[in-house]
């Protein structure tokens, strides 16, 4: 892969109510099925017109899911993650991982193992600084005048 | 995508006995979930019976329970869907359904993602 990607990892909480139509996504991953180098991780591979997901509109494919009802997803075989999914009744309580693209740069997803990923504070405090010091020489520069 | 073709559907009497045919292609087989779906006229489509990917397990919508087995032979990228003691209520256009990954039950439509076009039980 050409260059540089870089990401904002944000999580959230999602409870969805598996409706008539089903919760409407589907999953890849596993020990037995690694969707991303170095990561067994189950990802969402697939949102589905009207389930609950794409009703809900918070989960979006390529998320990562960390656990189910409380119930962790790490080094799970494939199917053993579909069956806690399916096992996990009408309200669902997702822990999700969202992966934001920050940087112009081939898309893709980030492995566990890759140091790409970087805490939005690492992005802020520079720009921050940077503001901080752009407006002191901007006072220097008038009180000249 | 799965390309899916149906057959064995035909006009049988009641308490006869047909065995549908679902032959697949186009990805591996032997991970899919398999299902079989009814549509019969002016009524809503029906989930009938499903067949899991990775484990085999199958399950079965009440009112054929007992009457209908599903099957899969991985080697011939087919799954089977043998009805015995059929009703005149069996009747309908029978849709065979595969996917992979859902996290839904397999008697949920939206679980998934390619669909025959179906064939035809007449019970009479």
């Known amino acids: 892969m050409n260059g540089r990607v870089d990401y904002l990892v944000t999580e959230e909480e999602i409870n969805l109510t598996r409706g008539p139509s089903g919760l409407g996504f589907n999953i890849v991953g596993g020990t037995d099925q690694q969707y991303v180098s170095n990561d067994s991780g189950i990802y969402v591979s697939r949102i589905k017109e009207n389930g609950a997901a794409a009703l809900d509109g918070r989960l979006q494919e390529g998320d990562k899911i960390l656990s189910v009802n409380g119930q962790d997803l790490k080094n799970l075989l494939h199917q053993d993650a579909v069956d806690l999914f399916r096992n996990a009744g009408y309200a669902v309580s997702l822990r999700v991982q969202h992966r934001l693209q920050v940087q112009n740069g081939p898309i893709g997803h980030r492995g566990e193992g890759d140091p790409s990923g970087i805490p939005i504070f690492m992005v802020l405090v520079p720009v921050f600084a940077l503001t901080m010091v752009a407006a002191w020489a901007f006072m220097r520069y008038r009180q000249q005048l | 995508d799965v390309q899916l073709v149906e057959s064995g559907g035909g006009l049988v009497q009641p308490g006869g006995s047909l065995r549908l045919s679902c032959a697949a292609s186009?990805?591996?087989?032997?991970?899919?979930?398999m299902g079989w779906f009814r549509r019969a006229p002016g009524k809503e489509r029906e989930f009938v019976a499903a067949?899991?990917?990775?484990?085999?397990?199958?399950d079965y919508s009440d009112s054929v329970k007992g009457r209908f087995t599903i099957s899969r032979d991985n080697a011939k990228n087919t799954v089977y869907l043998q009805m015995n003691r059929l009703k005149p209520e069996d009747a309908a256009v029978y849709y065979c359904?595969?996917?992979?990954?859902?996290?839904?039950?397999?008697?949920?439509?939206?679980?998934?993602?390619?669909w025959g076009q179906g064939t035809q039980v007449t019970v009479s």
């Open positions: 359904a595969a996917g992979f990954g859902s996290v839904d039950g397999l008697e949920y439509p939206i679980s998934y993602d390619d």
């Open positions: 186009g990805r591996s087989f032997s991970s899919l979930d």
């Open positions: 067949i899991s990917g990775s484990r085999g397990s199958t």
